[in-house]
C-alpha cells in the first residue's frame, strides 16, 4: 500500500489521543535504556510503511502484536484516514486469523514496540535535511503529497 495520500494530521491526532498511551502501557515496567532503535524512516509515508510492517507482520520471536489494543487502533486509523487501505488488508487479515496464537509478551515483542515508538516519533516530527525539505509539514486538512 502507498501511504502517500493518507491524512497525516488525522493519523497523528489518533496516535496522540490513544495509540501512544497504549504503547506506553504495553512497555510499562521496561527500562528506558533497554532497547536501541535500529529501524528508521525518512518521511511520513515511509514511517507509516515501517509502522504497518512492524505492527502487523509476524516476526521471529514476536507473532502476536496484531492482536494488541494499539495495533487494532492503528489499523482503524489507517483504514479511516488512508484511502483504499482497508481493501488492501483483507487478505492480510485472513492470514492473520489463521496464524492466531495466545497473546505472549516476549522480550522480542517489547523490543519491537520500542522500535514502533521511535517510528511514531519520527512520523509525528519528521527530521528532514533543510535543502529541499519543504515537506516537514504540509498545509492542514488536505491530503499530502511527498516527493523524495
Amino acid at each position: 500500500y502507498d501511504f502517500t495520500n493518507c491524512d497525516f494530521e488525522k493519523i497523528k491526532a489518533a496516535y496522540l489521543s490513544t495509540i501512544s498511551k497504549d504503547l506506553i502501557t504495553y512497555m510499562s515496567g521496561t527500562k528506558s535504556t533497554e532497547f536501541n532503535n535500529t529501524v528508521s524512516c525518512s518521511n511520513r509515508p515511509h514511517c507509516l510503511t515501517e509502522i504497518q510492517s512492524l505492527t502487523f507482520n509476524p516476526t521471529a520471536g514476536c507473532a502476536s502484536l496484531a492482536k494488541e489494543m494499539f495495533a487494532m487502533k492503528t489499523k482503524a486509523a489507517l483504514a479511516i484516514w488512508c484511502p483504499g487501505y482497508s481493501e488492501t488488508q483483507i487478505n492480510a487479515t485472513q492470514a492473520m486469523k489463521k496464524a492466531r496464537k495466545s497473546k505472549v509478551t516476549t522480550n522480542k515483542c517489547l523490543e519491537q514496540v520500542s522500535q514502533l515508538q521511535g517510528l511514531w516519533r519520527r512520523f509525528n516530527r519528521p527530521l528532514l535535511k533543510q535543502q529541499g525539505s519543504s515537506d516537514y509539514k504540509d498545509d492542514d486538512d488536505k491530503h499530502h503529497h511527498h516527493h523524495h
Epitope: L16, S20, S32
Partner: antibody, heavy 119, light 107 residues
Amino acid sequence: EVQLVQSGAEVKKPGSSVKVSCKASGYTFSNYLIEWVRQAPGQGLEWMGVIDPGNGDTNYNENFKGRVTLTADKSTSTAYMELSSLRSEDTAVYYCAREDNTGTAFDYWGQGTTVTVSS
Amino acid sequence: DIVMTQSPDSLAVSLGERATINCKASQSVSSDVTWYQQKPGQPPKLLIYYVSNHYTGVPDRFSGSGSGTDFTLTISSLQAEDVAVYYCQQHHRFPLTFGQGTKLEIK
C-alpha cells in the same frame, strides 16, 4: 532517571567560537532527538536546531546563518553545540533538551550553560 | 517563519482565580502547540503538548485548548507556585518558534 548535564559557563571574545556539551543519561541516547534552545538575558526562548544522535541528521534555524554546528557522540552519550563568529548579542543561556516520547515536545532540559561574549 | 504572539505580556491574578493566556500563530499550525512554564534561574518545564495533553505530573488545573491559529492556556485556580513565565511553542514547521512569553504574577 533521565538527566541532561551541560558544561560550565564560558566567557568568549567577539569573533571566537564556543562549544557547549550536553551529557545524557538514564535513557538510550540514540533513540531521541536533542534540541538546542537559547535565552538572552531577560528575553524569551529561541530554537537553534535539532540533531538525531542515532544517525547525525540535523535541522538548523537559518536565522543563525550557518554559525551553528550540532554533533553527537554516541559512545559517550554527549551532544555538542558549537557557535562560531560570536558577537555580543550571542550572550545568553544555552539549553539542550530531549524530545518527549511522542516527538511533539521537549520533556527533559539541561540546566543551561551561560555564554558571555565580551571584549 | 511562523510568528507566535502571546497576550497579555504580563498578567496579575488573585490566588484561587482563573488565569488565561492566549497565543496566536501567524499561520495555521494545526494542533502542533506546546506550553512551557519557566521560573527564574531554571530551564523551562513541559506542561501541555499537542494543544491539550497533560505531561506526566502536571496538575489538572492546567489546561490547553485551540486549533489552527488561536490557542489558550488556562489555569483554573491559581496557586502561589504557578508564578512564572509561560511560553507557547509551535512545532508545525521548521524553524520551531516560541511566543515571547507571558509573566504571571499574584494580584
